[in-house]
């Protein structure tokens, strides 16, 4: 997270760290007791790695009573996701067992009504991604509030030049932005999950390159079918 600040500890009980061989790789969001939603691109190079999900964490390194690492039983990428595009960049991870719920571990309601979030709405994005262009990684969860940007502006030739589909949404990126390591994490508007940080290699913090988020409401049928 660029231009953000440390989050209040355990105030985002839905927040997940998707890890490979014990290292944070991407964010994720607990959407059901046994399921975490993330981005499909996150794990494409984990061919011989052990994928696990950390729940109930604020610090990645320090012991915390609510922290628990879960193995992954199944990883279900959206069937139309591909490594060469950010379209359909969603992944559902089935935990090896139901998460132990409590004040610091709780699923987040996700948007089912397929309607664009009003431009200008302030939404919260959180993650353990880099906090500087130098690549400094935080140990504690960071967050930032970002205004939603209308799709027409986001699709300008000077911005994302038509790449933003109806199934994506944008947020402003003027010095405050999601960045590398935040991919797969949640964009939360009014207490509801609206978007998932896409995992392309986009430049961060440049206002001409707004943050791109996959709209979960657009994938309600797929999410429901996997969770069923």
């Amino acid at each position: 997270i660029l231009g953000g600040r440390e989050a209040e500890a355990h105030a985002r009980p839905y927040m997940a760290s998707v890890q490979v061989n014990g290292e944070h790789l991407c964010g994720g969001v607990l959407v059901a007791e046994q399921w975490v939603l993330s981005a499909a691109h996150c794990l494409e190079d984990a061919a011989d790695g052990k994928v696990q999900v950390l729940l109930g964490a604020h610090s990645l390194s320090q012991p915390e009573p609510s922290k628990r690492l879960y193995d992954v039983l199944r990883a279900v990428p959206h069937p139309d996701s591909r490594p060469d595009t950010i379209d359909h960049d969603l992944l559902l991870l089935q935990l090896s067992e139901k998460a132990t719920l409590g004040p610091a571990v709780r699923p987040l309601p996700w948007q089912r009504v397929d309607r664009d979030v009003e431009p200008g709405t302030l939404c919260d994005v959180a993650g353990w991604g880099i906090v500087s262009h130098a690549g400094r990684r935080p140990d504690r969860l960071q967050h930032v509030l970002l205004p939603v940007l209308d799709r027409a502006t986001c699709n300008r030739r000077t911005h994302h030049d038509g790449a933003i589909t109806q199934r994506m949404m944008c947020a402003e990126s003027n010095r405050r932005d999601s960045c590398k390591g935040d991919s797969g994490g949640p964009l939360v508007c009014g207490g509801v999950l609206e978007g998932v940080v896409t995992s392309g290699s986009r430049v961060c913090g440049n206002r001409k390159k707004p943050g791109i988020y996959t709209r979960v409401a657009s994938y309600a049928a797929w999410i429901d079918s996997v969770l069923a």
Epitope: E44, D45, A46, A47, D48, V51, L73, A75, P77
Partner: antibody, heavy 121, light 108 residues
């Protein structure tokens, strides 16, 4: 429906080389890490190689490291296994296998029909 | 590397009988990374049970899997003729991933 079809198996002399292919269909091949697994004449199964979805990372057991090379062509939905310095103990049925979990570290939920390599003088 | 030892190597059962085969690991394996395959003569292996106890698609509910640490098992509650096959366990908890030598189930 997922289909994996191996080809290229042959009779090769010790020290020789051979390249196996696996044509994949019915799924987004470029999204999956892929593996080769072999079955020796005494019916033992042995993992041979794994490659990440984009082909950036490859993994091998010590028994084939330095002699075998796994590669892929995502544009053609094809997986390869280049084998060199072949030994008699490489004689086996070679299967192309797709993992249940797309990144690779998991069980294999789809297997091809196999192609046979015989190394003998 | 982790060595998986399957026992018995060969077993014989009558239809309707309950059978259990075991897979022992030379060191502890997480239950998430222990899998079973079924193979019939002339066919490729088929994923049968993944992550210790989860039946793969199309596997009859008479099959079950259990275990933890270094000891795992596959059980058939009431054997049927079509279950005659060789069953292999596999671990992917530590690299290299390895397979057991198999248990061949024959029907009387």
């Amino acid at each position: 429906e997922v289909h994996l079809v191996e080809s290229g198996g042959d009779l090769v002399k010790p020290g020789g080389s051979l390249k196996l292919s696996c044509a994949a269909s019915g799924f987004t091949f470029s999204r999956y890490g892929m593996s080769w697994v072999r079955q020796t004449p005494d019916k033992r199964l042995e993992w041979v190689a794994t490659i990440s979805s984009a082909g950036s990372y490859t993994y091998y057991p010590d028994s084939v490291k330095g002699r075998f090379t796994i590669s892929r062509d995502n544009a053609k939905n094809t997986l390869f296994l280049q084998m060199s310095s072949l030994k008699s103990e490489d004689t086996a049925m070679y299967y192309c296998a797709r993992p249940l979990n797309y990144y690779g570290t998991s069980s294999f939920d789809y297997w091809g029909q196999g192609t046979t390599l015989t190394v003998s003088s | 590397q982790i060595v998986l030892t399957q026992s018995p190597a060969i077993m014989s059962a009558s239809p309707g009988e309950k059978v259990t085969m075991t897979c022992r690991a030379s060191s502890s394996v997480s239950s998430t990374y222990l899998h079973w395959y079924q193979q019939k003569p002339g066919s490729s292996p088929k994923l049968w049970i993944y992550s210790t106890s989860n039946l793969a698609s199309g596997v009859p509910p008479r099959f079950s899997g259990s275990g933890s640490g270094t000891s795992y098992s596959l059980t058939i509650s009431s054997v049927e003729a079509e279950d005659a096959a060789t069953y292999y366990c596999q671990q992917y908890d530590s690299s290299p991933n390895t397979f057991g030598a198999g248990t061949k189930l024959e029907l009387k």
